[in-house]
Interface confidence: low
């Protein structure tokens, strides 16, 4: 028998520094977790103690904090090289700055293979990107070899900016021939490493013949055997065992997100490469694990540029950006309109001639808007200003919801109107009329939404049985502010870009902004 230790991360999303327990900015160092300096300490400890160790990343290192905004992926290559990752799969967010934003800072700088079997380049890009990412890589580990085959969500064109010269194929269809190729090369221990979410991970384990282990990402899935050590509730045991169509027991793992945990899986293979046993658990990277001093010093050096960036002008406003709770928790506010417009703008993807865009709607809890921005400071808007407006370090995500769920959400928005509560919704691509004289649960008297399957966008009544795409804060997607119906009834959820980054990019693009209150949210009394 031969034993392999797989250490794995996924969806780190730019959390190079330690974070608080909820993966937002570290406030009390004694309680902070994760970060590459702490990760390195634990990885080195395991490398010293165990003979056959692989350190893998399942994608979405890009996007999530000011680190990515400023360094644009150079930080990912630098610190992943420093930690000596053995391989990485491409995630959807690796394409956020286009293909060039992937090639230059990461693909050309990484000292480890970057993988995806189901992304095929065409046209002029094919020769430019050739060899910079691979469908698979055979890695020597001790006296043996292990094949790593990569995959990426085929929804990436809807979630990021891969351009028109990359084709995202079905994962299972693309993986099978690559695994077969590895078998012909006498590689009998094969790990599928990828970024398509837990459901697809399980399907790959079930359907792709020859895959021994699946290491996934994208869905931020937390698996754990026994009593979990922090706030995350396990979606199942670690590893999650799938019985493949050919009768093998295939371990599937994922390690939540944000570098909070290091996945730790021990696999025992027989001499023919069959998995005999698998066990482990994610390791919580809490403050009991010291930060490595050399990596920490490097982080501090790279940090200097961030502090400088946060005070630089992104653009100007010529109007007061009303982000006060007195406005945004009671009525349409122009800060809410600005943020929603930025959220839609960030999701412009012309992937189908029938649609002007794949999504037109935005909702945003008024309680998530934490500060106004005064235009009388020469109109200047900085990252620091935006951090006061959006301090939670959340993301703006894409969900699919039925019209009936949206209607419930808007009823919830005003079910206890007048108490300055955070659930009052700001909107984009939506016209809503409330009648507060009616009883809670029956106050939405008009709800019109902007069409997507149209050449000239216009507002049509919401259809209860239709499925709509909506951009919203991850806080709402997870049922925050009492929006349990969104969490319970959403049909699909893909995590998006860092909230501040979305707004800052929009302001930089527009240069001068002047959002208005324009009748997106109205109040009426009596009949309609």
């Amino acid at each position: 028998a031969w034993e392999l230790t797989i250490l794995h991360t996924n969806d780190v999303h730019s959390r190079l520094e330690q974070t608080s327990e909820d993966s937002s900015k570290c406030v009390n160092a004694s309680r902070c977790m994760g970060g590459v300096a702490r990760l390195f300490t634990k990885v080195q400890q395991i490398r010293r103690a165990e003979p056959n160790v692989l350190l893998l990343d399942a994608g979405d290192q890009y996007q999530g904090t000011i680190w990515f905004t400023v360094y644009k992926g150079a930080e990912v290559a630098h610190f992943m090289n420093a930690l000596r990752y053995d391989a990485m799969a491409l995630g959807n967010h690796e394409f956020d700055n286009g293909v060039e934003g992937l090639i230059e800072p990461l693909l050309k700088e990484a000292k480890f293979p970057i993988l995806s079997a189901n992304i095929k380049a065409k046209g002029p890009l094919a020769s430019q990107i050739s060899g910079l990412y691979l469908p698979y890589k055979v890695l020597p580990v001790g006296d043996e070899v292990v094949g790593i085959v990569g995959y990426t969500s085929k929804e990436t064109p809807f979630l990021s900016n891969p351009g028109t010269n990359l084709v995202f194929e079905d994962e299972i269809t693309a993986l099978q021939p690559e695994v077969d190729k590895l078998k012909t090369l006498n590689v009998n221990k094969i790990i599928a490493l990828g970024h398509s979410g837990f459901e697809m991970d399980k399907l790959i384990a079930q359907k792709v013949r020859g895959v021994d282990v699946v290491v996934g990402g994208h869905s931020n899935t937390f698996l754990y055997t026994g009593n979990p050590p922090s706030k995350e509730v396990p979606a199942g045991k670690y590893p999650f065992i799938v019985t493949s169509d050919d009768g093998r027991k295939v371990p599937v793992v994922q390690a939540y997100a944000f570098g909070k945990y290091l996945g730790y899986l021990k696999i025992e293979f027989d001499e023919r490469g069959n998995v005999i046993s698998s066990h482990g658990n994610p390791i919580l990277l809490n403050s009991s694990i010291p930060e490595d001093p050399s990596i920490k010093a490097d982080i501090n050096k790279w940090r200097i540029k961030l502090d400088n960036y946060s005070t630089q002008e992104l653009g100007k406003t010529i109007v007061y950006l009303d982000g006060s709770s007195q406005s945004c928790r009671f009525r349409e506010c122009n800060m809410g309109n600005l943020i929603c417009d930025a959220m839609i703008n960030n999701n412009l993807r012309h992937t189908d001639e029938m649609f002007w865009n794949h999504v037109s709607m935005c909702i945003l809890n008024g309680g998530g808007i934490r500060s106004p921005i005064d235009e009388r400071n020469n109109g200047t808007i900085t990252w620091e200003n935006l951090a006061a407006v959006l301090p939670f370090g959340g993301t703006f995500d894409l969900v699919q919801l039925k019209g009936s769920t949206l209607k419930k959400a808007f009823e919830h928005s005003v079910h206890r109107y007048g108490q300055s509560t955070g659930e009052f919704l700001q909107v984009g691509g939506i016209h809503v009329v409330y009648d507060l004289s009616r009883k809670p649960g029956d106050r939405v008297v008009k709800l019109d939404v902007l069409c997507t399957k149209c050449r000239v966008p216009s507002y049509d009544p919401l259809k209860m049985d239709e499925v709509y795409k909506v951009i919203l804060p991850n806080f709402l997607a997870n049922g925050g502010d009492g929006f349990q119906m969104i969490k319970d009834e959403l049909l699909r959820h893909d995590s998006g870009d860092q909230d501040i980054n979305v707004v800052s990019t929009y302001i930089s693009k527009m240069k001068v902004i002047y959002p208005a209150v324009e009748g997106r949210i109205k109040f009426s009394t009596g009949s309609h």
């Epitope: 909820d22 937002s24 406030v27 009390n28 309680r31 050590p229 919580l284 301090p391 806080f475």
Partner: antibody, heavy 120, light 111 residues
Framework: QVQLVQSGAEVEKPGASVKVSCKAS????????ITWVRQAPGQGLEWMGD????????NYNEKFKTRVTITADKSTSTAYMELSSLRSEDTAVYYC???????????????WGQGTLVTV | EIVLTQSPATLSLSPGERATLSCRAS??????????MHWYQQKPGQAPRLLIY???NLESGIPPRFSGSGYGTDFTLTINNIESEDAAYYFC?????????FGQGTKVEIK
């Protein structure tokens, strides 16, 4: 609804130890920090320390570090605060409180126990 | 540790008046756009009750006549249209770093 119910009043001799319990209900006990705060007669509030029941992580005020032990029993959703080497100035009402922080790590104390009077 | 100084020690007001309570921190308690300062009300024989968290956010169920403001080191709790039931001690508390500390309190009396 969220409730924190503390054990009853205690009278202890100087040098002895006291263990106060705090039973939580109405929320996920393992997901929120429990803090202990004390208030001497006619005085202000003093933060003693806290525990994250999910992992057992604790933080203590340096002033009490050598004398206080905070623990939690996940099976009964109960937190405990034990103070040893009691002296007369430890006479106070001892409160447990739940820290909030759903949308951010704000650590404000959103629910409190009724308090336990410890007389030394 | 961060020292919180509250003023005045006692405030005596008539119903309907506005109360302004101050809390000054010896060190900046703000980071990341937030001020980690909270306000509590305590009536005799009762446990404290959270009024305001993160300097300006009204806790659920607290009447809107209570409001908080400030950033960094200087914070204010305001009670508009004060009522007799508002007679109590008011404490500020920070959670910026360990140990978390409380102010010494302001006593609000209603004439």
């Amino acid at each position: 609804q969220v409730q924190l119910v503390q054990s009853g009043a205690e009278v202890e001799k100087p040098g002895a130890s006291v263990k106060v319990s705090c039973k939580a209900s109405g929320y996920t006990f393992t997901s929120y920090w429990i803090t202990w705060v004390r208030q001497a007669p006619g005085q202000g509030l003093e933060w003693m320390g806290d525990i994250y029941p999910g992992s057992g992580n604790t933080n203590y005020n340096e002033k009490f570090k050598t004398r206080v032990t905070i623990t939690a029993d996940k099976s009964t959703s109960t937190a405990y605060m034990e103070l040893s080497s009691l002296r007369s100035e430890d006479t106070a009402v001892y409160y447990c409180a739940k820290e909030g922080g759903l949308t951010t790590e704000d650590y404000a104390l959103d629910y409190w126990g009724q308090g336990t009077l410890v007389t030394v | 540790e961060i020292v919180l100084t509250q003023s005045p020690a006692t405030l005596s007001l008539s119903p309907g008046e506005r109360a302004t309570l101050s809390c000054r921190a010896s060190k900046n308690v703000a980071t990341s756009g937030y001020s980690y300062m909270h306000w509590y009300q305590q009536k005799p024989g009762q446990a404290p009750r959270l009024l305001i968290y993160l300097a300006s956010n009204l806790e659920s169920g607290i009447p809107p006549r209570f409001s908080g403001s400030g950033y960094g080191t200087d914070f204010t709790l305001t009670i508009n249209n004060i009522e007799s039931e508002d007679a109590a001690y008011y404490f500020c508390q920070h959670s910026r770093e360990l140990p978390f500390t409380f102010g010494q309190g302001t006593k609000v009396e209603i004439k």
